[in-house]
């Protein structure tokens, strides 16, 4: 409708690392003569309309979300209604709505995408001694405490993807972070290097692990 307050948020999701602070940007255009006494600002979870933080009756009413939110009080009068979310958790992921009411009202939703990098994979071999060409071995690649779920790729020493006989499992811990375990069953050649790559699809971060088998003995490359 003509004259309705226009609320603007980023189109792209805000990406925040677990444990860091995130700013959910939201702005409106104050009319000449605007004062904070006229402003009613509500931040809420989009899906449930549960209150997160509010500014009404000319003052900051505080956080209704585990005391981890804050506004930017010095910037409100210029139309900056952004919300600071502290110590981001996996459970915070989702859509937040910025609802602004002055003479009329408007709202817009911004998405928060939470991410956590995966640890450098550790590699284990079973069996791990007296290996000979033709033996079937199980190589396990384990990477921990990442988010969201990882993509896992295996390849041999020549860079040829290994897609058969791979089983990958991902388990979330109590914080919602994933531990990934990927198992490759392979028949040994005379010697060979087997690499796993654990990719965080949001951060576009790759964590690499590899194991080299040279008949006798077996060596692991040093940790990077």
């Amino acid at each position: 409708p003509t004259g309705a307050v226009e609320v603007q948020v980023p189109e792209d999701p805000v990406v925040a690392l677990v444990g860091t602070d995130a700013t959910l940007r939201c702005s409106f255009s104050p009319e000449p003569g605007f004062s904070l006494a006229q402003l009613n600002l509500i931040w809420q979870l989009t899906d449930t309309k549960q209150l997160v933080h509010s500014f009404t009756e000319g003052r900051d009413q505080g956080s209704a979300y585990a005391n981890r939110t804050a506004l930017f009080p010095d910037l409100l009068a210029q139309g900056n209604a952004s919300l600071r979310l502290q110590r981001v958790r996996v459970a915070d992921e989702g859509s937040f709505t910025c609802f602004v009411s002055i003479r009329d009202f408007g709202s817009a939703a911004v998405s928060l995408q939470v991410a956590a990098p995966y640890s450098k994979p550790s590699m284990t071999l079973e069996p791990n001694k007296d290996l000979r060409p033709g033996d079937t071995v199980t190589i396990t690649c384990s990477s921990y405490r990442g988010y969201p779920e990882a993509e896992v790729f295996w390849q041999d020493g020549q860079g040829v993807p290994l897609t058969g006989n791979v089983t990958t499992s991902q388990m979330a811990n109590e914080q919602g972070l994933f531990d990934v375990h990927s198992v490759l069953r392979v028949v040994l050649g005379a010697n060979g290097t087997y690499s796993c790559l654990v990719r965080n699809p949001v951060l576009q971060q790759d964590a690499h692990g590899s194991v080299t088998i040279t008949g006798q003995p077996m060596t692991f490359p040093p940790e990077a």
């Epitope: 307050v5 989009t46 709202s107 817009a108």
Partner: antibody, heavy 124, light 109 residues
Framework: QVQLVQSGAEVKKPGSSVKVSCKAS????????INWVRQAPGQGLEWMGG????????NYAQKFQGRVTITADESTSTAYMELSSLRSDDTAVYYC?????????????????WGQGTTVTVSS | DIQMTQEPSLTTSPGGTVTLTCRSS?????????ANWVQEKPGQAPRGLIG???KRAPGTPARFSGSLIGGKAALTITGVQPEDEAIYFC?????????FGGGTKLEIK
């Protein structure tokens, strides 16, 4: 349980105005949006505008801009919709419907409570 | 202007399952459109069935469910009852206003 009770039927002359009231009773806490929706004979539902009584702020559909005024009296839990410069095609049933800006229960039920409707007939 | 499209009419049988949809001219419907479904029967005021895409209003039977399917809002009635014969309107929220669809007349045969 919230209830919305609307004022009675009206017969109006073309060019005049009509003011319809909508009184909320029972558990009216929280930040509500009172919408006004009309239905002309044989037609669908049409959103005219809405008001947040707690804030006193209203929005209007472009079609009705300048011809409709929505107000609220927080002290009596009553919302009003005034439509001016009435024409014969404004003959309709006018409804108020509550939506929650903030869902105090933590569940967003949308426009879950409707008034019984007010018939407005515009005829010379 | 935002246009919303619903099936003008649908026919189903008692005990059957039927899905009504609501398409927006602005593109895919999302959770921030808070899709509402409203039931209207002759001589009665409209009744809110579903809000916030998939939340059943108090008193709405469990056979009614809301969802997003292929970028559209959807209302599914599982185990249709004769009393479900009515007109169903969807409504979507666009930042500061509601827009209603034209309604779907559901006939039970």
């Amino acid at each position: 349980q919230v209830q919305l009770v609307q004022s009675g039927a009206e017969v109006k002359k073309p060019g005049s105005s009509v003011k319809v009231s909508c009184k909320a009773s029972g558990g009216t806490s929280g930040v509500a949006l009172i919408n006004w929706v009309r239905q002309a004979p044989g037609q669908g539902l049409e959103w005219m505008g809405g008001i947040i009584p707690l804030f006193g702020t209203a929005n209007y559909a472009q079609k009705f801009q300048g011809r409709v005024t929505i107000t609220a009296d927080e002290s009596t839990s009553t919302a009003y919709m005034e439509l001016s410069s009435l024409r014969s095609d404004d003959t309709a049933v006018y409804y108020c419907a509550r939506d929650q800006v903030v869902a105090t229960s933590g569940v967003n039920f949308g426009m879950d409570v409707w008034g019984q409707g007010t018939t407005v007939t515009v005829s010379s | 202007d935002i246009q919303m499209t619903q099936e003008p009419s649908l026919t189903t049988s008692p005990g059957g399952t039927v899905t009504l949809t609501c398409r927006s001219s602005t593109g895919a419907v999302t959770t921030s459109n808070y899709a509402n479904w409203v039931q209207e029967k002759p001589g009665q005021a409209p009744r809110g069935l579903i809000g916030g895409t998939n939340k059943r209003a108090p008193g709405t039977p469990a056979r009614f469910s809301g969802s997003l399917i292929g970028g559209k809002a959807a209302l599914t009635i599982t185990g249709v009852q004769p009393e479900d014969e009515a007109i169903y309107f969807c409504a979507l929220w666009y930042s500061n206003l509601w827009v209603f669809g034209g309604g779907t007349k559901l006939e039970i045969k």
